[in-house]
């Protein structure tokens, strides 16, 4: 007996779609083996029509697909635009068509119901608008126009030209009679309900000379689109509800076990706390379409999602909706990385961001999630080196360790840096991830002087004290610029007095600038790392002044306010600054921080045993 199971009998009507689900035991072998849908011929052979390996027969091209859901032990065959010719005997199965792991399915496609001659068929999704056209002859032009709904043997008046409106259609129906010469009237029904489904009759005039036209209205509930995304990854729901609701509040909701729909996010400012820090509703286009991005996908995010429009910002019958069934794959290609990173005030964090390793050349970005209104994510830094001005000297995006991970370092932390940040690229949008930075009690581990003023032409020595726990780490100094942090030669000077509770393993590493030049002004970072994995950093600003010049003063690196026109994450497509960005419509314009001098320019340092490999500037 085959362990594969499905529907023995499937029936539908011409023009419709079917979605055939076949179930199998989700063993490791079964989950990964080929899935197929084939048609049994007279000879007994079963000819493949569609398979999980991407094959689609010419007869099914553009109207069928097969999707495997390995964790659920299910695969789904969708077939659209059915015709009578599709009736027959089929098999859904695993492995090779001629072997036993299969299930017999009989598909019967019948003609739609018999309709009166000349009936016009209108097929419309629930919540949308239909316009029923009703022709008439000249002699009936001045007479009453009406639309009836046929219910069994009776006809119920829906609307007429004497201003009658059936209560079931109140506020959503209108009858339009054109000017002279046009021998057609129209009935427009908005916000269609499933109960509007049925046969209608247009009538102009009365008696034996009346004009009649039948209309068959088919109101369809949207079939959920299958969405299969990886755990920890990202999903984007694109929602296009039509111009009729362009100016109405929009929402995304998730269907619960009671079959009601809980708002996940809406344009009225409501957001489910379970999605805090990992959801954005992107501003709608002129046509009323919008999209919702959810990152950091969890198993519990699975379910049926609906997007819609209604002035209350939640699901109401008779308003347009779109549906998705989201599955979250636990066998994720997206590596585990910390979802929370903790740092202390004055200290630093190093965040590891995953990206699709097949896209090593993609641009990398880091943005700060802001929850106000629909959520937004202004970019703070990108791999090409643009950094928001207020993060100058304390934020850097490094290509290391590479091969599917980049690093973002943020130092000089304050409580205001606590929040949610997104890692993203201009490539595969499913790899967007979220990390929360928390600021906890404690002292920074690395100790450097406060801001330093150096004298032109003289020698400057900057010490960086590190505790014994970092004794096995590589220490480095680097000069920060908006394109990275260029490693400088530094000198390990032995024991440090800064950590009284440590033995001789508590050391300091010094940076010497000799002689100091104008180009040496800027931010310097002291840091520790293990191979390509970065640890803590501490930052010092070096101001350079003339030797003994009266009236000279210390130059403070003022933290600029946020640029008003910063780049902001959304989920579409746009070009910025002549750089093609594939999925961002990502971004609007942004001010660019000017490069703060040549990297390492002018530093003539004492060289000791510490590494001088370049940090962050190039991809290893």
């Amino acid at each position: 007996k085959s362990p594969v199971f499905g529907p023995q009998e499937v029936s539908s009507v011409e023009g419709n779609s079917v979605s055939i689900k076949c179930y199998y035991p989700p063993t490791s072998v079964n989950r990964h083996t080929r899935k197929y849908w084939c048609r049994k011929g007279a000879s007994g052979r079963c000819i493949t029509l569609v398979s999980s390996e991407g094959y689609v027969s010419s007869n099914y091209a553009g109207r069928a697909n097969l999707t495997n859901f390995p964790e659920n032990g299910t695969f789904v065959v969708n077939i659209a635009q059915l015709s009578r010719d599709d009736s027959g005997h089929y098999k859904c199965g695993l492995g090779i068509n001629s072997r036993g792991l299969s299930f017999d399915v009989s598909l019967e496609v019948s003609q739609g119901p018999e309709l009166p001659n000349g009936t016009e068929v209108y097929t419309v999704d629930v919540g949308r608008t239909v316009t029923i056209k009703c022709p008439f002859k000249t002699e009936n032009a001045p007479k009453t126009k009406a639309l009836y709904k046929k219910i069994g043997q009776t006809s119920v008046l829906v609307i007429d030209s004497r201003n009658y409106v059936n209560p079931n259609y109140k506020d959503r129906i209108r009858l339009r009679i054109p000017g002279t010469g046009q021998l057609i009237f129209t009935v427009v029904i908005d916000r269609l309900r499933l109960s509007d489904h049925g046969l209608y009759l247009c009538q102009a005039g009365d008696g034996s000379n009346r004009d009649e036209k039948n209309a068959d209205l088919q109101v369809l509930e949207p079939e959920p689109e299958l969405v299969y995304e990886d755990l920890r990854g990202s999903v984007t729901f694109h929602c296009a509800l039509g111009l009729e609701v362009a100016n109405v509040a929009k929402f995304l909701c998730r269907v619960n076990s009671r079959e009601t729909c809980d708002v996940v996010i809406n344009t009225l400012g409501k957001r489910d706390s379970a999605f805090e820090g990992r959801i954005l509703l992107n501003p709608q286009d002129k046509d009323g379409s919008f999209s919702v991005v959810i990152t950091g996908l969890r198993k519990e995010d699975e379910g049926r999602y609906l997007c819609g429009a209604h002035s209350d910002g939640q699901l109401q019958e008779g308003w347009p909706i779109q549906a998705w069934q989201l599955f979250v794959n636990e066998e994720s290609t997206i590596p585990r990385s910390p979802t929370v990173v903790k740092g202390v005030a004055g200290g630093s964090v190093a965040v590891l961001c995953p990206y699709n390793p097949k896209e090593s050349q993609s641009l990398k970005y880091w943005c700060l999630w802001e929850g106000a209104q629909n959520g937004r994510c202004p970019l703070l830094v990108e791999s090409q080196g643009l950094v928001q001005e207020q993060y100058e000297g304390r934020l850097s995006l490094l290509q290391e360790p590479g091969n599917g991970t980049f690093t973002v370092i943020l130092n000089q932390l304050t409580t205001q840096d606590a929040g949610f940040y997104w890692c993203l690229t201009n490539g595969d949008t499913r790899w967007r991830t979220t990390v929360e930075i928390k600021i906890i009690e404690g002292e920074p581990n690395l100790k450097v002087p406060g801001n330093v003023t150096a004298v032109l032409g003289e020698t400057l020595n900057i010490p960086c004290h590190f505790p014994c726990k970092f004794s096995s780490y590589e220490k480095y100094w680097c000069k920060w610029s908006n394109t990275g942090c260029q490693t400088l030669p530094s000198q390990d000077e032995g024991p440090s007095e800064a950590f009284v509770n440590c033995d001789e393993n508590s050391r300091l590493v010094s940076l010497t600038l000799n002689p100091v030049t104008r180009a040496d002004e800027g931010w310097y970072w002291c840091g520790v790392k293990q191979g390509h994995f970065y640890g803590e950093t501490a930052a010092v600003y070096v101001a350079v002044e003339e030797k003994k010049v009266a009236g000279s003063r210390y130059v403070s690196p003022a933290k600029a306010d946020a640029a008003p026109d910063e780049k902001v994450l959304d989920s579409g497509v746009r070009e910025i600054e002549n750089k093609a960005i594939q999925d961002p419509r990502l971004f609007a314009e942004e001010k660019v921080v000017a490069d703060t001098g040549d990297q390492a320019g002018g530093s003539r340092a004492s060289v000791d045993s510490s590494s001088s490999e370049e940090q962050g500037g190039s991809s290893k």
Partner: nanobody, 126 residues
Framework: QVQLVESGGGLVQPGGSLRLSCAAS????????MGWFRQAPGKEREFVTA??????????YYADSVKGRFTISRDNARNTVYLQMNSLKPEDTAVYYC?????????????????WGQGTLVTVSS
């Protein structure tokens, strides 16, 4: 909430026929699958048949033990599902339960349906 009421059970001779009905009321518009399960004395509840629908397409599922003998059907207007049982055997004796499910995704053989009826007894005996 959805209420399910079964009817049509009774005593029948081997080889005979019986038709069970399951009438649904309440929030029936959210139902996408209705199934029949049975439980013989001292045994676990087992799947018999199910019907699933979406738009004007329907999908019928049968357990191997009843394939070719039992037929499931649905009257949309009456919110009722029928189970036509032919060629009945003594081993078909059980309490037959009607069940309703909201999900189009769950395996219809699993017993994690959202709503259940009280059951109707079918006895096949000479």
């Amino acid at each position: 909430q959805v209420q399910l009421v079964e009817s049509g059970g009774g005593l029948v001779q081997p080889g005979g026929s019986l038709r069970l009905s399951c009438a649904a009321s309440g929030r029936t518009s959210s139902i996408s699958t209705m199934g029949w399960f049975r439980q013989a004395p001292g045994k676990e509840r087992e799947f018999v048949t199910a019907i699933r629908w979406s738009g004007s397409s329907s999908y019928k599922y049968y357990a191997d033990s009843v394939k070719g003998r039992f037929t499931i059907s649905r009257d949309n207007a009456r919110n009722t599902v029928y189970l036509q049982m032919n060629s009945l055997k003594p081993e078909d004796t059980a309490v037959y339960y009607c069940a309703a499910q909201m999900s189009l995704w769950r395996d219809p053989r699993e017993i994690d349906y959202d709503y259940w009826g009280q059951g109707t007894l079918v006895t096949v005996s000479s």
